[in-house]
Structures are given as C-alpha cells and as structure tokens.
Interface confidence: medium
C-alpha cells in the first residue's frame, strides 16, 4: 500500500496549522520546558513500512485525542482547531486504508505492540504535564512545540523509509 501523495501534503499542512496555532512565544516559556521522552526509535527501528504505519496511526490518533479535549478547545483558536481536526482525520483515514489492505500485519506483532505502547506512554506523560501545569498558556505552548517536533520527526522518518523502498 503506497500512501497517497496527499498524505505527505496533509502532514505538511498539519505542521503549518500547528505553527499558526501559536499564541505566545516559546522563548517566553522556556523555563517550562520538559523532556517528554519522545520514543523516536520506535519510528526509526521499524525496517518495513508495514511496521511503521500502525505506530504512525497511533501517534496521529493520540494527537487527535489530545487536541479534542475541552481544555484544548479553550486554549486554541476554534477555526484553526477545526482545520487541524480535518487534516488529522484525513491522515487517519489514509493510514487505516493501508492497515485494512493487510500491510499492518507483520511477522513481528509483539514488536509493533511495544512501539504502540511507547507512543501511548509518551502521550500520557504529556497529559500529566498539562494537568500538573494546570493547563497554563505556557504549558500548552510547550506541548504545541513538542507535538510539532515529534510529528515532524515521525513523518520525516516515515518519508526516509518510503525513499528506501
């Protein structure tokens, strides 16, 4: 299953929307920085696209969940959020179509499950951080920046995987 070219464009649009959502400068929030421990190796160590797709799907699903909360709705511009949801939803559809085609089934399901769990734990750390920081504007800015970074890293790794095939 080759993900459509629109998927790559969608990834870029997602990043652009995340960039536009910025409300305050990250530099004014640097003292609130936090290392969430993005499990980069879970995207880089999957040697087959088949193994990456379910992990990427989990990543996008978790981003969707994170930005779908009422606390998120209060923090960000509603119009940008709606556009953001639409982009994520389209990407989830693209990835689900690949999984349905059987690409998601590999000889190493356990390895894939571990990767999905690592992504879930990563988002649990982000959610906990927001709670601890009482969903402050700086906490949301740190999280927005973190999601931009992790999303960019995961999609770049996916692109490099595609170019190897």
């Amino acid at each position: 299953c080759d993900l459509p070219q629109t998927h790559s464009l969608g990834s870029r649009r997602t990043l652009m929307l995340l960039a536009q959502m910025r409300r305050i400068s990250l530099f004014s929030c640097l003292k609130d920085r936090h290392d969430f421990g993005f499990p980069q190796e879970e995207f880089g160590n999957q040697f087959q696209k088949a193994e990456t797709i379910p992990v990427l799907h989990e990543m996008i699903q978790q981003i969707f969940n994170l930005f779908s909360t009422k606390d998120s709705s209060a923090a960000w511009d509603e119009t940008l959020l709606d556009k953001f949801y639409t982009e994520l939803y389209q990407q989830l559809n693209d990835l689900e179509a690949c999984v349905i085609q059987g690409v998601g089934v590999t000889e190493t399901p356990l390895m894939k499950e571990d990767s999905i769990l690592a992504v879930r734990k990563y988002f649990q750390r982000i959610t906990l951080y927001l709670k601890e920081k009482k969903y402050s504007p700086c906490a949301w800015e740190v999280v927005r920046a973190e999601i931009m970074r992790s999303f960019s890293l995961s999609t770049n790794l996916q692109e490099s995987l595609r170019s190897k095939e």
């Epitope: 990250l26 003292k31 920085r33 920046a145 970074r149 960019s152 770049n156």
Partner: antibody, heavy 123, light 107 residues
Framework: QVQLVQSGAEVKKPGSSVKVSCKAS????????INWVRQAPGQGLEWLGG????????HYAQKFQGRVTITADESTSTAYMELSSLRSEDTAVYYC????????????????WGQGTLVTVSS | DIQMTQSPSSLSASVGDRVTITCRAS??????LNWYQQKPGKAPKLLIY???SLQSGVPSRFSGSGSGTDFTLTISSLLPEDFATYYC?????????FGQGTKLEIK
Amino acid sequence: QVQLVQSGAEVKKPGSSVKVSCKASGYTFTSYDINWVRQAPGQGLEWLGGTVPLFGISHYAQKFQGRVTITADESTSTAYMELSSLRSEDTAVYYCVSSVGAGAYYYQGLDVWGQGTLVTVSS
Amino acid sequence: DIQMTQSPSSLSASVGDRVTITCRASQSISSYLNWYQQKPGKAPKLLIYAASSLQSGVPSRFSGSGSGTDFTLTISSLLPEDFATYYCQQSYLPPYSFGQGTKLEIK
C-alpha cells in the same frame, strides 16, 4: 553520523558584515535548536543567539541585538549567522552548536559542535 | 541577564586527585546547568547536562550535582587527558550565559 560543518575562515574590515554558514547532517535539522557561540582569542565562551527552524523563531543575546541575524534554510539543512558593523573585538572563532542528544531538549545541553570558523576583523 | 560565576579560575592538581569545580548562578536556574570541557584548539565538549545527567560517551569519573543557584562538577580521579578548561553554562533563560572557565593544570 550527526555533524555540523561550517564555512571557512574570513578576514573582514571594520564596519563590514560577515555571514557564516553551518551545514547539518545526520539528523532532522528542523526539529532541533541551532545556536551560535563565539570565543575570542584566549577568552571564554559567549552565546550570541539561537533558533529552532521548525518554529521559525530566533532569539538573540541583548548584547548583539540588531547586529546579529540567525537564519535557517530547511531545504539545504543549513543555518547562517550574519554579524554586521564589525569591530576588532568581534575577532573570534564562531561555533554553530546544537542540542541533538537523546537526553537533550531545546538549549538543554549543546552536544554537537561545528569545527569553528575564525573571523578576523582588521583594517 | 543571568550571571554565571565559576571558582576557582585555575587549579593545579595531580593525576589521581579528586577535583571539584563550582558554579554559581545569579538567580535560580532550577537544574538547567551544563558542563563543558575544552582543550586548546578544539571545540568544547558537553560532559554533563541538566546539572547531573552524564552525556553519552563521557566517562563515569565525571559527575555533576546541585540545583537552584549552586552547582558542582567533580572528577573523581584525574587522568592525564582531563587537564583542560571547564565551563559551566545555564540553559534556563536566554541569553544562555557561560561561566568564565576553570583551567585545570598539572601540578
């Protein structure tokens, strides 16, 4: 492997500008910070400014505000540092540096250093 | 701006000695403190980040401690290759200032 390769040595006249380049390889360039640090002969280290290309924002030390510009070209994974209105005190080795290590976060620890570019300001 | 003050500015020691370098910040910087080693003609090398985390590949004889305003770098047993200049740096708020350096020389 992860590395930063800087442009060659420059000799400049007082009042002129210098633009030093820094090409990154071995990592996702846009997602990490790029900093510029200088060291005058026999002196200590001084942070000029930094940027995270992904966020499109740069920050400068007050001392250099208005004189230094840090930019990044994502298509070539290259960062640039331009310093204007040069004076003799700007003679130094200029390093581009990044926080790329697994434990590092933005500006947390500068673990990847370029080889340095000597800028000499002399009339 | 946050000022970083290192002490001593120079230090003579022998191979096998235990050495401690201190760094003080002009205001609290939490644990955003890094330590670097620099040898003549070379770029600095990150030893410790976040006050006490050992950078990958750095020998365990190097350790860092402290939080708030007072920090220390300890070398448990000096080796010949440890003679160099050491810098602390805060990464709490820009500008990310460095200490003035501590030159560690052979006695």
